[in-house]
Interface confidence: medium
């Protein structure tokens, strides 16, 4: 969370950004809020990126002004125009690229004053894991698969019954490059699984942490997955 103050004569406004992460190939949002101003025509929003000449996006007089937009962002950006008057200056970024990572500045000018705040935007790939029984293995085994990760994550297994146990000796993890030659499919197999236990497959890189759980008993099988972005908010 970054809060910036701007001073215009005696006037300043608070601008707030949130460090966020983009999933490459998908759409992302760079979050920015400011003190609302009912006078839409008096609001100017500028998004800038460190090291890039020209603007990422500009919104003024109630509409987009892309005359100074850098070519790498052409056709890929939009603000939430209907939410600008309530103080939302967040930027929608289409088809996130690895090169979109960096430091962005959200600059706001309204009739009340002006202000800005920076945000760190990380890019990578992250996806939910799914755990299933592996029928190709010779022993009772679980297979954890997640289709898209970048950078290469670490994978760890845990179990409710054997808390603190090191499963690295009884698991095998592989990374398979996807067709776009950036992201990778993660596959991890855990061997010698026993029933009446809950197993967790944890996949983590510096952008996200994902966990897949499978509850294994002889009378039910239940799954749960969750994904958490790191260092955000």
């Amino acid at each position: 969370l970054i809060i910036g103050f701007g001073i215009s004569g005696k006037h300043f406004i608070t601008v707030t950004t949130f460090t966020s992460a983009g999933n490459i190939g998908e759409d992302g949002t760079l979050s920015c809020t400011f003190e609302p101003d009912i006078k839409l025509n008096g609001i100017v929003i500028q998004w800038l990126k460190e090291g890039i000449k020209g603007l990422v996006h500009e919104f003024k007089e109630g509409k987009d002004d892309l005359s100074q937009q850098h070519e790498m962002f052409r056709g890929r950006t939009a603000v939430f125009a209907d939410q600008v008057v309530v103080g939302n200056a967040s930027l929608r970024l289409k088809n996130v690229q690895l090169t979109d990572a960096g430091t962005y500045t959200c600059y706001i000018r309204t009739s009340k004053g002006k202000g800005n705040a920076n945000l760190e935007y990380k890019t990578g790939a992250f996806s939910m894991p799914e755990i299933n029984v592996d029928y190709n293995a010779s022993s009772e085994s679980l297979r954890c698969e997640a289709p898209r990760w970048f950078p290469q994550p670490t994978v760890a297994w845990a179990s409710q019954v054997d808390q603190g146990a090191n499963f690295s000796e009884v698991s095998n993890t592989s990374f398979e490059l996807n067709s776009e030659n950036v992201t990778m499919k993660v596959v991890s197999v855990l061997y010698n699984v026993t029933i009446n236990n809950t197993y967790s497959c944890m996949i983590e890189n510096d952008i996200a942490k994902a966990t897949g759980d499978i509850k294994v008993t002889d009378s039910e099988v239940k799954r749960r997955s969750q994904l958490q972005l790191l260092n955000s908010g």
Partner: antibody, heavy 119, light 108 residues
Framework: QVQLVESGGGVVQPGRSLRLSCAAS????????MHWVRQAPGKGLEWVAV????????YYADSVKGRFIISRDNSKDTLYLQMNSLRAGDTAVYYC????????????WGQGTLVTVSS | EIVMTQSPATLSVSPGERATLSCRAS??????LGWYQQKPGQAPRLLIY???TRATGIPARFSGSGSGTEFTLTISSLQSEDFAVYYC??????????FGGGTKVEIK
């Protein structure tokens, strides 16, 4: 070899009760979850209930919940299905089947016992 | 609850011909699918588990394929003893375990 033998089927009036038994042999009964699966005449297979290896967990199909009770006696290697408030729609061949391990399909079935609910 | 749908309901095939049976899940079940054969007056018999692995003692003419929501059981060359009803069953998430409605393979 694994053997499952059901018994206790017969003709019963609607609203009455019946108890089915399944005698197991050829495997360590107390180590495996056990299921009941039924098949109405000329119809498909319907899973009915499961009980965990130690009897601590039971699950039922919505169609029998609150009326049927699955139980087991590990000292006798026997599975039971207590069927109460029987309806015409419960008429079926009832099979017991062995679950187990991480593999929740049925490699072993009994020969089935027919339950007919009719007035 | 995961709903399993089998098609066709009846398949007429001549002995020696190939039979292809389909099974569709209402949501992804990965490879957690079994196929059973049932002859009149008998209990079902497990043919395939894990969508494609033959159970012990099942002839090589039976093969399973598919993953996610679409599955197929293929009998490469039908023998007289293969005319029966075939059921698919999902065990991805349960209870409840659910079966398809069945496909009857009859002599053409």
């Amino acid at each position: 070899q694994v053997q499952l033998v059901e018994s206790g089927g017969g003709v019963v009036q609607p609203g009455r009760s019946l108890r089915l038994s399944c005698a197991a042999s050829g495997f360590t009964f107390r180590s495996f979850g056990m299921h009941w699966v039924r098949q109405a005449p000329g119809k498909g297979l319907e899973w009915v209930a499961v009980i965990s290896y130690d009897g601590s967990n039971e699950y039922y199909a919505d169609s029998v919940k609150g009326r049927f009770i699955i139980s087991r006696d590990n000292s006798k290697d026997t599975l039971y299905l207590q069927m109460n408030s029987l309806r015409a729609g419960d008429t079926a061949v009832y099979y017991c089947a062995k679950g187990g391990g991480l593999r929740w399909y049925f490699a072993y079935w009994g020969q089935g016992t027919l339950v007919t609910v009719s007035s | 609850e995961i709903v399993m749908t089998q098609s066709p309901a009846t398949l007429s095939v001549s002995p020696g011909e190939r039979a292809t049976l389909s099974c569709r899940a209402s949501q992804s079940i990965s490879s957690n699918l079994g196929w059973y054969q049932q002859k009149p007056g008998q209990a079902p018999r497990l043919l395939i588990y894990g969508a494609s692995t033959r159970a012990t003692g099942i002839p090589a003419r039976f093969s399973g394929s598919g993953s996610g929501t679409e599955f197929t059981l293929t009998i490469s060359s039908l023998q007289s003893e293969d005319f029966a009803v075939y059921y698919c069953q999902q065990y991805n998430s349960w209870p409840p375990l659910t079966f398809g409605g069945g496909t009857k393979v009859e002599i053409k």
